[in-house]
Each structure stands twice: as C-alpha cells, then as structure tokens.
Amino acid sequence: AGVFELQIHSFGPGPGPGAPRSPCSARLPCRLFFRVCLKPGLSEEAAESPCALGAALSARGPVYTEQPGAPAPDLPLPDGLLQVPFRDAWPGTFSFIIETWREELGDQIGGPAWSLLARVAGRRRLAAGGPWARDIQRAGAWELRFSYRARCEPPAVGTACTRLCRPRSAPSRCGPGLRPCAPLEDECEAPLVCRAGCSPEHGFCEQPGECRCLEGWTGPLCTVPVSTSSCLSPRGPSSATTGCLVPGPGPCDGNPCANGGSCSETPRSFECTCPRGFYGLRCEVSGVTCADGPCFNGGLCVGGADPDSAYICHCPPGFQGSNCEKRVDRCSLQPCRNGGLCLDLGHALRCRCRAGFAGPRCEHDLDDCAGRACANGGTCVEGGGAHRCSCALGFGGRDCRERADPCAARPCAHGGRCYAHFSGLVCACAPGYMGARCEFPVHPDGASALPAAPPGLRPGDPQRYL
C-alpha cells in the first residue's frame, strides 16, 4: 500500500505565439482546480476507461479576476498535494490524466458552473520510494508544470511497496533469511505472509509461514505436481514424503465435524462447515457471541450480544461461509482473456498471460501494433488481430490523420451550444442545465441531480468520468 502524490507547480500560457485568453474576467471571476486519474501499466489513456489505480480532486484555488488588457499570467493554484492512495502493489509503469477545471463564480443560476480547461495525459515509469519526478505537459496553448512521486505507507517498503518492514526485535540482526529494510536500517523485512517461495498459483496460506497446496500439487512450496502413476489408488490425502496420492481412509470418513457440521475434503485435510453458533476446526466451539470474534478474514460480526442470540458475519470480498472461513474461487468466473492463467492472490486477482498478450486481464494483443504508427499523438491499441488508434482529442480516422469535428455528433444535451476547442469540445449550456454535456438539470434549490460520485469526487463536482 502507498500513496501517489502530485504537486502542481504552475498552470499558464505556454511558450510561443498565440497566448490563450485568460479563463476569468472581471465579469466572470473564476478559480481553478485539478483532477488526476491513474491507471496501471500499459492501459489505454482513453478518458472513458476507469481510473483503476485511483483518482483525486484538488481543493479549489484562490479566486482570480482578469486585469483588463493584461496577458494571461500563471493562474493562482490550489494549496497542497493531490494524493491518490493505492492499496495493492505499485505497478512501476502507470498512465496518468491530469485535468484543469475552471469554476466560474459569476451570477450563475443554480450555483457555479464548471468547464474543462485542459487535459494532459502520459505514460511513465516510476519506482516507489524514489525522488520527486518533474514534468511539463502542454495542452494547446496552455502549459502545466508538475512533480510526482509514489511512496509506500509503513510497514510496506520497496520499489513496489510489496516488502514489509517492522522494528527489529534485536539490535544487530534481522530474523532468519530476512534483510534490513533500506533505507530504514533500524527495521527489518517482516516475514512474508506465506512461506517464502510458496507458489502463487498452487499454494496458499491461512497463517504466516504456511504453504498449503491446492489439489494436484505437493512439496514444501507447492511446486511439485502430484504423480498418481506409482500409486495404488487415486485417493487422497497427499503424502508429504512421496508426493503421491496414497490409498487410505478419506479425511471425512466418520464425519469429524461435531454439532451438525458438514465435512468436505481439502487437498491436505478436511474442512468443516459449521452451523451458526458453532465454530472451530471441528465445529466443537459453541455458545459463540461477537465478543468471541467468530468472523474470520476480516468479517464484520453483527448481533449475538448474548450466547442465546445468533450472530451474523458480513464477509469481505473474496470470502464466504457462516464465519467467512471459505475463500471464494473468483477464478471460476474465468476473468482472464485469451487463455490467460487466473491467480487468486487473496487481496487481488492476477492474470498470467500467454505469450503475445498483456494487460490486467490479458486483453491486449501485443503484436497488433508492431510497426504501426498513429499520427498526431494517437496511441495504438491492440485487439482482435487488427490495430486501432485511440486518437488525441481533436483528431480521428483510422490513423488519427483526420481533423475531427467534435461537435458533429451534437454532444451537448438540452439545447446546449457546442464549441470546438483545443482539448475537445466545450458545451455552453442553456439556462437550467449544467455538466460537461449539459446533461444535468439544475434544481431550483441549487442542488443538481448528479449521479453517485465516483471515489474522490463529491456530488456537485464536475461529472467528467475518466
């Protein structure tokens, strides 16, 4: 886990001729704010795709009023950093979109109006824990200067925030096989949750240090396929010493589960599904209340204040069962495309892609774009054996060579007027409507009928989903 931090240094006219007009005027004072959208790895920069790594919105900047006759200066900026927390590993390569928004503070009916001034996008390589990286991006006549970094939240460390650190228990050395946590030399790597080297495909753990194997696999790290060729009978459980399915009674023979629990075989043992009010390896623990902490894997316990009343466990994603004791096989939904191998890591799903495919779900065909070029800043997107270009704003066609008329599709709703603009299009809404496409009616009380805001946006913020 960690935080991506973005510091905006300046937003103003870029170098060269054709300085932009100030976005604010004496009649229409305004202020700026910024939105950042992050996506992992080689994802498309298309504005519509979700901000899978997260998004953040800045505070509003100071109110600015243009001085008549003066050229547009660098505009006053909001204070502070934009911070995008990430829960899993930092991916190393990421795509970003930074939008500059204008909030007009004139006598608007129904409150302030927002419009998108500029959008910049890029793809970068960045290691967590490194220094601030500086960048300059241009959007039409505007120029945005900013810095960014990714930092890990303790106890995570490393370039991907995947190693854990904790204070050393002894002054001079770390635990067996563990290294000091540079640059925190007074701390040590914490042991991995599972046994170090435990196969992510075929092993899992429920306690630190364990490496329990899925059916068909054996060995200390679950890397050895079970061989049935030298066995008398294809019945479990798996023998630790031979790596062979050995004959013998099944682990559920005689039902080891007490109090009406039902038994099911697992690769190495058995598992009891207990009726409510009982838990434990064999459903032997009874009279349970929430005070006993019967919900596993971060489940939330509700009810059951006294032993006679039942409790209910509300399970977090990925777990089920009356005590959240069962891991959901999320790979059964076959989320990986193009023959990719699905890995359920507990905290996340990962797809291991076949050669020639990439992307979080193996959805990108890597060969399609070989030797292809998209003009005017367009990005080549793989898929289905034929490349296509995701064009920069203002361009279209198969190779982004044609100037697009963004207003041709009449995108402004409710009688709004469309203006072609360097960053796409701008809608001037008819009275009583607001939003990037004039899609939201303004209520008489000043509130807007906006849909539920995505993370990082409050209702009432610009509904320009990326």
């Epitope: 067996p176 170090a196 080297g197 240090g209 200390p220």
Partner: antibody
C-alpha cells in the same frame, strides 16, 4: 543477533525417550520454520522434519515417523523434538535450524545424544 | 526420495586456486538447491540458497549456478579459512535430502 541455542549433551539408555530443545533469540518463532537435522559420522546429514511454531503444521521424513515428535512453545520461543524408543542408531549430533523459506538459514550449535547401555 | 550426488568426494587445492564443486540430483529440483559449509566441530553454515542467491555476510568469492539436476558451487581464489566440508541440500520435495559432501582440503 539471531541465535538458536540448543540444550546440552544427553547420555541415555536404550528404550528411553529424550526431549531436545532449541531456543530462538533475536526474533520470534511464529512465521518461521524450525528444521531438525541428524548427523552421524559416515552418514552425512539427514533431514528429520520441520515444524511451523504457532500452527499445527509439521512435516516428517517417513524414516523418522514414530521416532521423532515436534512441539513448540511460542511464549518461550522454544521448539522441542522428542525422540522415543532410543537405540544406539539414534546416537548422533542433532541440529535445529531456522528458515522462513526452505533453505536452512541459521543453525543451532547442535546437541550430542549418546545412547548406550 | 531425491538423491543428491556430490563430486568429487575430496578436493585437494592450494590457497589462491579457484575450484568448482558439483552436485547432481536424481530428478529435477528446479532451483530449490542450497549449499552449506561445515568446518570440523562446527555447525553447518548457509553459503548459497536457491542455486545462486548470495547470502549476507558470506564472502563474494562463493557463487552458485545451475538448475534442474546439475548444480555447481564455485570458490574463486580459495582462502585457508575455506577448508572443510561442503554439502548441497534440495528442498523441492519432502523429505529434504543432503548430498554426501565434498571435503575441501589443503594440498
């Protein structure tokens, strides 16, 4: 400093049982495996098995099943190996070692067991 | 059980020489092979883990290579403190097994 401190030498009679201890200092046991290894002159090193303290996980070499039993007390940071029905073949140096993977990263100084009538 | 065969059984060298010790497995152990040094009346000490990973505190003259069934421990420019027994160990499957050892002695 990471150390595994093993109990002292033992002289036992055939048929008896003995419990050897291995106390870890410099880190806490849960999450790390304790491995037990036997060394006899002319027989090299033999892996007896392993235990994950704080859990029910243990793996035994088939050859030592019924001979060795592993336990651990996480409150005292100590692992134990009981050897039963001793014979002269059990005379050896017994090492404990610690790991969070499968390499034997740190070793105790060894306990010499002599079985003699 | 997986059998590890070390060769040669004894290696006589002069300080300053570079030597290679071999460990061959009866079946593939992937890279789950580790090397240990044991001096007389001392406990074994881990030198290399997972075939080629170096260990903090172990001199850089020790290096490991190989995967599958054939592995090599190389000592560049042997020093007098390096004499003793060297064992390989596989942890790809239970039971873990050790090689019979190579004795490195002074010529």
């Amino acid at each position: 400093q990471v150390q595994l401190q093993q109990s002292g030498a033992e002289l036992m009679k055939p048929g008896a049982s003995v419990t050897l201890s291995c106390k870890a200092t410099g880190y806490t046991l849960p999450g790390y495996w304790i491995e037990w290894v036997k060394q006899r002159p002319g027989h090299g090193l033999e892996w007896i098995g392993e235990i994950l303290p704080g859990s029910s996980s243990a793996n035994y070499n088939e050859k030592f099943k019924g001979k060795a039993t592993f336990t651990a007390d996480t409150s005292s940071n100590t692992a134990y190996m009981q050897l039963s029905s001793l014979t002269t073949e059990d005379s050896a140096i017994y090492y404990c070692a610690s790991t969070y993977g499968t390499s034997l990263d740190y070793w105790g100084q060894g306990t010499t067991l002599t079985v003699s009538s | 059980d997986i059998v590890l065969t070390q060769s040669p059984a004894t290696l006589s060298v002069t300080p300053g020489d570079s030597v290679s010790l071999s460990c061959r497995a009866s079946q593939s152990v992937s890279n789950d092979l580790h090397w240990y040094q044991q001096k007389s009346h001392e406990s074994p000490r881990l030198l290399i883990k997972y075939a080629s990973q170096s260990i903090s505190g172990i001199p850089s003259r020790f290096s490991g290579s190989g995967s599958g069934t054939d592995f090599t421990l190389t000592i560049n420019s042997v020093e007098t403190e390096d004499f003793g027994m060297y064992f390989c160990q596989q942890s790809n499957n239970w039971p873990y097994t050790f090689g019979g050892g190579t004795k490195l002695e002074m010529k």
